[in-house]
């Protein structure tokens, strides 16, 4: 099956590698423009310069292209505790963050959140906190992993899936008594 | 097939609470976030709260901290919203949403929503 390409994908491809195709002279190839810059006016003619203008302040374009417009720059989301590493350039988007000792968790592809790594109390740490995963805790006995906090087996109730993780203290318990008996 | 049913709006006096359940069905529950989208009268969709599917992520506008509480019981396939010291301003068709793993639109499904009106 041959891939489906879109109008402007079809004409760019008639053009050698870093030009594309006059919008209204199919036999002139024009030069794309430089990231930073965007597309003002066509070439007029074969081996005449594209016109092509520097982004304006707020927005910017990340590679060659021939685009009436340059792409809006990102904004970091505040109320997701997002935090900017490096401010948008006229070739480079705003780079969005978490601080220090949180990561990256994305409701969606395009939108994260940042939390606070886990602390593993009254348990160990077996994986490190990482840019887009939260700490993984393994807990120590008596102790059942609930939302990646360790919680006592005292607050386990019978209906929750702790009982499994909580059943061998509860045993020990059983067995010390049974053998204190004898 | 996708279904979010709502229920659990009224009408409730300010400083009241109310508790929104969601069942969902036709999907792995288990796999998704899910949130809780409103629309006030004449306004624009507003995201109200989101929990993950599984671990302890939870986000909640501004407007709401403190006082709405998110929830889930996987074992049920219900997401609830715990609404209390409820305000004029909180009136709002309630939707319960699904939330996209990919694309750059979060939200991908939705329910019919449940009025809450809150009025002396």
């Known amino acids: 099956l041959v891939p489906h390409l879109g109008d402007r994908e079809k004409r760019d491809s008639v053009c050698p590698q870093g030009k594309y195709i006059h919008p209204q002279n199919n036999s002139i190839c024009c030069t794309k423009c430089h990231k930073g810059t965007y597309l003002y006016n066509d070439c007029p003619g074969p081996g005449q310069d594209t016109d092509c203008r520097e982004c304006e302040s707020g927005s910017f374009t990340a590679s060659e292209n021939h685009l009436r417009h340059c792409l809006s720059c990102s904004k970091c989301r505040k109320e997701m505790g997002q935090v900017e590493i490096s401010s948008c350039t006229v070739d480079r988007d705003t780079v969005c963050g978490c601080r220090k000792n949180q990561y990256r968790h994305y409701w969606s592809e395009n939108l994260f959140q940042c939390f606070n790594c886990s602390l593993c109390l009254n348990g160990t740490v077996h994986l490190s906190c990482q840019e887009k995963q939260n700490t993984v805790c393994t807990c120590h006995a008596g102790f059942f992993l609930r939302e990646n906090e360790c919680v006592s087996c005292s607050n386990c109730k019978k209906s929750l899936e702790c009982t499994k993780l909580c059943l061998p203290q509860i045993e020990n318990v059983k067995g010390t008594e049974d053998s204190g008996t004898t | 097939e996708v279904q979010l049913f709502e229920s659990g709006g009224g009408l409730v006096q300010p400083g009241g609470s109310l508790r929104l359940s969601c069942a969902a069905s036709?999907?792995?529950?288990?796999?998704?976030?899910m949130g809780w989208v409103r629309q006030a009268p004449g306004k624009g969709l507003e995201w109200v709260s989101m929990i993950a599917h599984a671990g302890p992520e939870t986000y909640y506008a501004d407007s709401v901290k403190g006082r709405f509480t998110i929830s889930r019981d996987n074992s049920k396939n219900t997401l609830y919203l715990q609404m209390n010291s409820l305000r004029a301003e909180d009136t709002a068709v309630y939707y319960c949403a699904k939330i996209s793993q990919f694309g750059s639109n979060a939200l991908d499904y939705w329910g019919r929503g449940t009025l809450v009106t809150v009025s002396s």
């Open positions: 036709g999907f792995t529950f288990t796999r998704y976030s």
